[in-house]
Amino acid sequence: EVEKTACPSGKKAREIDESLIFYKKWELEACVDAALLATQMDRVNAIPFTYEQLDVLKHKLDELYPQGYPESVIQHLGYLFLKMSPEDIRKWNVTSLETLKALLEVNKGHEMSPQVATLIDRFVKGRGQLDKDTLDTLTAFYPGYLCSLSPEELSSVPPSSIWAVRPQDLDTCDPRQLDVLYPKARLAFQNMNGSEYFVKIQSFLGGAPTEDLKALSQQNVSMDLATFMKLRTDAVLPLTVAEVQKLLGPHVEGLKAEERHRPVRDWILRQRQDDLDTLGLGLQGGIPNGYLVLDLSMQEALS
């Protein structure tokens, strides 16, 4: 708390300007009117106040707006935003994308802080869904943003927003998240032709079911090994050797280097050795010739 002291004669601030730069903490508290500060917040950023001075300015705004700042003030907070606590931010009602961008710009170069996470949460909840413009903005500032959401939160992402997603935005997503995003991406890109569709859908394929992978294998897509290794194991297992060969195209040779890793390892164990041999890659571990393969899961389903 800053002690209440009278403003020295001639030091009362008539406007927020650079003359305040060397005011001490108590002088700022005594000589700057909170209402004046609120109407001239945009000027604060143009003055290199120290963090100690910014603390005093925040204190003045807190006293003026105990229920939370209006958006007209929030939009111009600048470095004062870094002084806000998540509790402060929970009192705000941020509806403008411009306000969100202004505050994210301040935090640029920092990790996503609890303040930013709270701000985004308030903003998205206020909008009701994660629309394309918001997603565009958030992933521009935080490429990993999408993968920080729970599958439940991701379910509110409309398919139209998927167009804003870049491959790097999905780098840290786990299979449960891709399970939610993949059907949305499939819907979003459904009107594209084969090769263009594959380019767009490729990053989301970690959520693709077997039947979609089979369909892709008929389209000469030449999937790279990095994408193949991110596919769901349960989706890869039912694929035949011929289908995997078509799916990977010239990249099929990369299977040898990955034969000890999932999903390749598990897939090999499900294939006939004869069929694996047709690839000429020396893949070992398939089902020996003459062995009968019983799909017990299918038998259980029938009974």
């Epitope: 650079e18 003359s19 143009a46 120290t50 963090y51 600048g78 470095y79 870094l82």
Partner: antibody, heavy 123, light 106 residues
Framework: QVQLVESGGGLVKPGGSLRLSCAAS????????MSWIRQAPGKGLEWVSY????????YYADSVKGRFTISRDNAKNSLYLQMNSLRAEDTAVYYC????????????????WGQGTLVTVSS | IQLTQSPSSLSASVGDRVTITCRAS??????LAWYQQKPGKAPKLLIY???SLESGVPSRFSGSGSGTDFTLTISSLQPEDFATYYC?????????FGGGTKVEIK
């Protein structure tokens, strides 16, 4: 490309005067708060003086108050330091430095520096 | 506010992980910057807000800390990193610098 070029340094006797200049280019000089920072031989950095973008607000370190005067000419993209009553302890490399801006934000940091000019006060 | 850097000098080899500390005489939140100065050259801003990398600065440089204790870390020392490093506080005026840490070749 941002450039700050200091000039005016040299050898001066105790009690003498010097005027340092700093020519700025490659950025909007009138937007920036500017500083003089000095470094005595083999020593650390000391913030000497500060002038706001318009020139209306000025700061001096206690060690130079009353002897040094900072000024700027935004039309000429130039910063100046008039040094009077010089003492042996004023011997140092004097750097001109701009404040830090990432539009629209400013922090009291030093973003761009000149190469410095040496001031030697000795009899 | 006084800033005390330690060590005042250190010897290290290329590839080493180097850590420099800066202690403030009172709490300064995250209002700390780090500069690099090579012999005969002007200082260069590396980090501000205790941990934010200035644009164009290699990611091997990182900063941490808050309050009174701060650290500059160079994850894998490169030949061009041999220099003197200074911390600066911008929590309150007058702005002050630490005494510097010279990083020399072992």
């Amino acid at each position: 490309q941002v450039q700050l070029v200091e000039s005016g340094g040299g050898l001066v006797k105790p009690g003498g005067s010097l005027r340092l200049s700093c020519a700025a280019s490659g950025f909007t000089f009138s937007d920036y708060y500017m500083s003089w920072i000095r470094q005595a031989p083999g020593k650390g950095l000391e913030w000497v003086s500060y002038i706001s973008s318009s020139g209306s607000t000025i700061y001096y370190a206690d060690s130079v108050k009353g002897r040094f005067t900072i000024s700027r000419d935004n039309a000429k993209n130039s910063l100046y330091l008039q040094m009077n009553s010089l003492r042996a302890e004023d011997t140092a490399v004097y750097y001109c430095a701009s404040g830090w801006i990432r539009v629209p934000l400013r922090l009291p940091l030093f973003q761009h520096w000149g190469q410095g000019t040496l001031v030697t006060v000795s009899s | 506010i006084q800033l005390t850097q330690s060590p005042s000098s250190l010897s290290a080899s290329v590839g080493d992980r180097v850590t420099i500390t800066c202690r403030a005489s009172q709490g300064i939140s995250s209002a700390l910057a780090w500069y690099q100065q090579k012999p005969g050259k002007a200082p260069k801003l590396l980090i501000y807000d205790a941990s934010s990398l200035e644009s164009g600065v290699p990611s091997r440089f990182s900063g941490s800390g808050s309050g009174t204790d701060f650290t500059l870390t160079i994850s894998s020392l490169q030949p061009e990193d041999f220099a003197t490093y200074y911390c600066q506080q911008f929590n309150s005026y007058p702005l002050t610098f630490g005494g510097g840490t010279k990083v020399e070749i072992k």
